[in-house]
């Protein structure tokens, strides 16, 4: 008895396609060995038609593929455009030769059944409607018109011109005539199901002079589109249901053992498993919409169906579209943490991965919002100015070429908790979903700026110091001036000893920034931060107000925004060891679809694209850099 298993018999008709799944035992060798599909000849030889090594025979060219799913211990052979010549005995198997472990499959492809020569064939998809045309002679114009469905023994009435309707067609069948044409009547049947498929007879008149016409109605389930996606990447289900359901609620569901569970619909329902990583986007007035899922997980694989119905739930007899989603665990997208933790007043540095081959792509960061159909407005981007409510506390640092850009958010509040997406205008798979959790601070901050009440006087010298703990001793410290195009790192020269020190005096570790002389352009937000190479760590922010020298003037309060900075300074707390554990945001690369597939994000990005330079790690805040010095004590 073979340990390989599959369908022993597959029967199909010409023109259809088959998808044959073969199951193999769960061993490492089996998962990685060659998979094949071969045809058995009279001599007992089995000729390979397709294998996982990339071999494809001439007769399968352009119409077959073989995909291994090691995580499920299965492989699938898909064959399209079947002909009767495909009828035969086959084997699906494992091994370097076709004499390895295998399973016998018999494939029979029949001709589409012959119908009476005068039969009109209507082929419709489930949920659609059909209008059957029934011609008759003028002398039968006054007579009764009817449509009946053939059963084994008789022909069961569907509808007639005396308004008799079969109970299973009530509300679905209409018999009518068009205009003044008295030689044709029509029967429309809506919300078609598989049970409606079969042979019908339309008739006008009675007895031998009656006009009759044979009709074959074929009601087809939509063929599932096969989607192969990498773990942590994204998928977009493009659903096109047609104009007749344009005004109905739309849904996407996934088949489980018993039903199709709604994942999201346009009435606001959303499966909690997809929180933060799903959007549904109505496309137009023609019933088109798309559903985007990022951060694909192994358990997302399965059979999906989109549809439309006023309830937002699957209903028999309404149009649907289906997909079979396979999630490949051997992913090119790096495995990163999907949850980032911060504390009130503190900061997070989120490392966003992107396809390293697309270093010049535009980078964005958006906040996922679940209200309505879900959307993700862009907060910052390489050519998108920071949204106003994030002034002074959000910046994107692009590090071209290394496959990562960093988004820093500081002065955290509990309202910042939620889901965020990293996205680019390039490879749509590299979109990542990050959940930001913000806890109340319980300890003193790691970085502290003095003076906290920062008001500089025009024309004078002004120094601010950033105190850091010994654990940051070996890290690079920096000051940058924030603008809505980024945080431009200020030029520095290191005056402090950088070599390892046996002891570290906690009280004397600081990095200072001096403005000399102070000008009006110096007013604004400044960040003090730490980094190790291209890995950014904690930051803290301070607002420096600039005022003119007035006799006996006292310091004025430096705006509400600075009040926020002061709170941050009082409350920021981070775990020991720079941001690598709790605070360093290493996202789970939940990727994405292209810009048009997520209009909310795409449009937002478009609106926010500014012509100015993006903030970069090595930008200058102003031309006269000599005024800015970093002193390491």
């Amino acid at each position: 008895k073979s340990p390989i298993f599959g369908p022993q018999e597959v029967s199909s008709i010409e023109g259809d396609s088959v998808s044959i799944t073969c199951y193999y035992p769960d061993t490492s060798v089996n998962r990685h060995t060659r998979k094949y599909w071969c045809r058995q000849g009279a001599s007992g030889m089995c000729t390979t038609l397709i294998s996982s090594n990339g071999y494809l025979s001439k007769e399968y060219s352009g119409r077959a593929n073989l995909i291994n799913f090691p995580e499920n211990n299965t492989f699938v052979i898909n064959i399209e455009q079947l002909t009767q010549d495909d009828t035969g005995s086959y084997k699906c198997g494992l091994g370097t030769s076709n004499r390895g472990l295998s399973f016998d499959v018999s494939l029979e492809v029949s001709q589409v059944p012959e119908l009476p020569s005068d039969t009109h064939v209507y082929t419709k998809d489930i949920g659609r409607n059909v209008t059957i045309e029934c011609p008759f002679k003028r002398e039968n114009a006054p007579s009764k018109k009817s449509l009946c469905k053939k059963t084994n023994q008789s022909c069961e009435l569907v509808i007639d011109s005396t308004e008799k309707v079969n109970p299973s067609y009530i509300g679905r069948a209409k018999l009518f005539m068009k205009g003044t044409d008295l030689t044709v009547f029509y029967v429309n049947i809506s919300h078609l199901t598989h049970n409606d498929a079969g042979l019908y007879i339309c008739q006008a008149g009675e007895g031998p002079s009656a006009d009759k016409k044979n009709v074959d109605l074929q009601v087809l389930a939509p063929e599932p589109e096969l989607l192969y996606k990498d773990l942590r990447s994204s998928v977009t289900f493009e659903c096109d249901l047609g104009r007749e359901v344009a005004n109905e609620a739309k849904y996407l569901c996934r088949m489980n053992k018993e039903t199709c569970d709604v994942i999201i619909n346009t009435l606001g329902k959303r499966d909690p498993d997809f929180e933060g990583r799903i959007l549904i986007t109505p496309k137009d007035d023609n019933g088109r919409f798309s559903v985007l899922i990022t951060g694909l997980r192994k358990e997302d694989a399965g059979h999906y169906q989109c549809g439309a119905h006023s309830s937002g739930l699957p209903q028999e007899g309404w149009p649907i579209q289906t997909w079979q989603l396979f999630v490949n665990e051997e992913s090119t997208i790096p495995n990163r943490r999907s949850v980032v933790k911060g504390v009130t007043g503190g900061s997070v540095a989120i490392a966003c991965p992107y396809n390293p081959k697309e270093s010049s792509s535009l980078k964005y960061w958006c906040r996922w919002e679940g209200d309505g159909n879900g959307h993700c407005p862009v907060l910052v981007g390489t050519q998108a100015q920071v949204q106003e409510e994030y002034e002074g506390r959000l910046a994107l640092f692009d590090q071209p070429g290394n496959g990562t850009y960093t988004v820093i958010l500081n002065q955290l509040t509990t309202e910042d908790a939620g889901f965020y997406w990293c996205l680019t205008n390039g490879d749509s798979r590299w979109r990542t979903t990050i959940e930001l959790q913000v806890a109340e601070a319980t300890r003193e901050p790691n970085l502290e700026v003095t003076p906290q009440n920062a008001t500089a006087v025009l024309g004078e010298t002004f120094t601010v110091s950033c105190h850091y703990p010994c654990k940051f001793y070996s890290q690079e410290k920096y000051w940058c001036k924030w603008s809505n195009k980024g945080c431009h790192i200020l030029p520095s020269h290191d005056e402090g000893a950088r070599q390892s020190s046996v002891s570290c005096d906690q009280s004397s570790q600081l990095v200072s920034m001096t403005l000399n002389p102070v000008s009006k352009e110096d007013e604004g937000w400044y960040w003090c931060g730490v980094k190790q190479g291209q890995t950014y760590g904690e930051t803290t922010a301070i607002y420096i107000a600039v005022e003119e020298r007035t006799r006996g003037s006292s310091h004025v309060n430096p705006t509400d925004a600075n009040a926020r900075a002061k709170v941050a300074l009082e409350e920021e707390v981070v775990d020991s060891s720079i941001s690598e554990k709790e605070n360093k945001a290493i996202p789970n690369p939940g990727p994405f679809a292209n810009e048009r597939e997520i209009q909310n994000v795409g449009d937002q990005a478009q609106e926010n694209r500014a012509s100015g330079d993006a903030g970069s790690a090595d930008g200058q805040s102003r031309s006269s850099s000599s005024k800015h010095h970093h002193h390491h004590h």
Partner: nanobody, 127 residues
């Protein structure tokens, strides 16, 4: 509550035939894989056969080795019914035969992938 109802069981002599039927009036039948399982006294429930339909012209039939070549599974989608034609019956085929339905197209032999089960129909093969 979606239900499936088996019929056609009975007492038959060894070498004889039986045709079991399973009606599933409440199901959106086209979406479902339909399977037959059996349970002999004191034994675990085991897979017998299953059938899938792609909603167009293709059917996939799966059989356990113990019934291969002696049984045929088929379905009538218009009647929401699945059949199991059993020939050359042996005493070891004696069991309660259960019909089951699932929309999950994983390994058809796995019992817990089937959500909907019938009450079963008794098949007794005498020698």
């Amino acid at each position: 509550e979606v239900q499936v109802v088996e019929s056609g069981g009975g007492l038959v002599q060894a070498g004889g035939s039986l045709k079991l039927a399973c009606a599933a009036p409440g199901l959106t039948f086209s979406s479902y894989r339909m399977g037959w399982f059996r349970q002999a006294p004191g034994q675990e429930r085991e897979f017998v056969a299953a059938i899938d339909w792609n909603g167009r012209g293709t059917y996939y039939r799966y059989y356990a080795d113990s019934v291969k070549g002696r049984s045929t599974i088929s379905r009538d989608n218009a009647k929401n019914t699945v059949y199991l034609q059993m020939n050359s019956l042996k005493p070891e085929d004696t069991a309660v035969y259960y019909c089951a339905a699932t929309t999950v197209l994983t390994d058809p032999r796995v019992l817990n992938e089937y959500a909907t089960w019938g009450q079963g129909t008794q098949v007794t093969v005498s020698s």
